[in-house]
């Protein structure tokens, strides 16, 4: 009974929830549930019944594979989906799919907190701003990644002349998308005019 699959998809996409194994042969009934107790659709003796739910009109069941097709998923569709199959023997088998729907990350804005010329070195503090999202950050100087320990929303570093970069890029990503923001400086250590 412990079949649990995790799925992460981008909001607005069409999703097919299905199991990796074959359905039991000649099963009697197949039901998809949303959050354990809300029926979405039930297949019974060659007929599907779609229940009144927020999914009505945007789901379709393929009884041969058991796949549930959902169009235009939204963040509110985050849930555990359960497919329950009643076998001819009277036994039930259950599969669970934990669906996580993520919005594509927005384009980040790089905010220059501080730039300071310090004895030929350049002290730099840049922050990568995006509205309240749980994302990963990667900073690049002229397309070369900074060390892992500097990878968070704020890049704070002192650069020596041989390490200067003209442009600094913040890449924000989640498991479904990534976007870049870039700011360019005039060597050695001043903001470039756009």
């Amino acid at each position: 009974q412990g079949h649990l699959v995790h799925m992460t998809v981008v909001s607005g996409s069409n999703v097919t929830l299905n199991i990796s194994e074959s359905l039991p042969e000649n099963y009697k009934q197949l039901t998809w549930f949303y959050t354990f107790d809300q029926k979405i659709v039930e297949w019974d003796s060659r007929k599907s019944k779609y229940f009144e739910s927020k999914f009505k009109g945007r789901v379709r069941l393929d009884p041969q594979s058991g796949a549930l097709y959902i169009s235009k998923v939204q963040k509110e569709d985050n849930s555990t989906y359960i497919m329950r199959v009643l076998k001819k023997t009277g036994n039930e088998q259950e599969w669970k799919i934990k669906l996580q729907v993520l919005d594509p990350v927005p384009k980040p804005v790089i905010k220059i907190e501080k730039i300071e010329d310090m004895d030929d070195n350049c002290y730099l503090k840049l922050s990568c701003v995006i509205p309240g999202e749980s994302v990963n950050y990667t900073w690049y100087g002229d397309k070369r990644p900074f060390p892992k320990e500097l990878q968070n929303s704020v890049l704070e570093t002192t650069l020596m002349p041989h390490n200067y970069s003209r442009c600094y890029t913040c890449q924000v990503s989640n498991s479904v998308s990534s976007k870049n923001g870039t700011v360019c400086l005039s060597p050695p250590c001043t903001l470039a005019r756009s």
């Epitope: 379709r60 393929d62 169009s71």
Partner: antibody
């Protein structure tokens, strides 16, 4: 047995509105979407939209947005389609149809059609 | 918006022959495609849905196949009552909307 019975033929002038009704019997009215499809003389099928009789929620083809209204009266087990600002090329047979299984994907039972003519 | 293109526009065959009608989608519709038959002065009738499932009461001589973008309706042995116009239909996901192909007229040769 499942039946959809539509109202009779209508004649209208350009700019007017028309209402077509579709009375259902033989099944649970609120379990299945009612779709409206039109067919101009000698032409193919054109989907106009659907109504979920349970909730009253509607969904229209882009082309008819703002000009079509779909309603239902669950006590009369009847769906209605109103089309406003009629033009001469709106002349067509209008069909109501029930979807096959309550999913909104395919249409298995159809009304007999209502002919609407539009001319001045 | 997904466009369905049916071919041929007209098919001339004799009773007893095999008819093969084609429907091509401009992008993948998975298996979510249906076929309808319409005779003059009548409402359409659902024949096949989900590409290959026969609707209730449809004779076994009608069969559907295909997935993705290419679909076929086959009538294994034409009966006189099969001569009609055939439409394929799919449903776009967003906004949810149904579209039909332009139709194939099956006529007696």
């Amino acid at each position: 047995q499942v039946q959809l019975v539509q109202s009779g033929a209508e004649a209208r002038e350009p700019g007017a509105s028309v209402r077509v009704s579709c009375k259902a019997s033989g099944y649970t009215f609120t379990d299945y979407f009612i779709h409206w499809v039109r067919q101009a003389p000698g032409q193919g099928l054109e989907w106009m939209g659907w109504i979920n009789p349970n909730s009253g929620a509607t969904n229209f083809a882009q082309k008819f947005q703002g000009r079509v209204t779909m309603t239902r009266d669950t006590s009369l087990i009847t769906a209605y389609m109103d089309l406003s600002r009629l033009k001469s090329d709106d002349a067509a047979v209008f069909y109501c149809a029930r979807d096959v299984d309550g999913s909104g994907w395919y249409l298995d039972f159809w009304g007999q059609g209502t002919l609407v003519t539009v001319s001045s | 918006e997904i466009v369905l293109t049916q071919s041929p526009a007209t098919l001339s065959l004799s009773p007893g022959e095999r008819a093969t009608l084609s429907c091509r989608a401009s992008q993948s519709v998975s298996i979510y495609l249906a076929w309808y038959q319409q005779k003059p002065g009548q409402a359409p009738r659902l024949l096949i849905y989900d590409a290959s499932n026969r609707a209730t009461g449809i004779p076994a001589r009608f069969s559907g196949s295909g997935s993705g973008t290419d679909f076929t309706l086959t009538i294994s042995r034409l009966e006189p009552e099969d001569f009609a116009v055939y439409y394929c239909q799919q449903r776009s996901d967003w906004p949810p909307s149904i579209t039909f192909g332009q139709g194939t007229r099956l006529e007696i040769k």
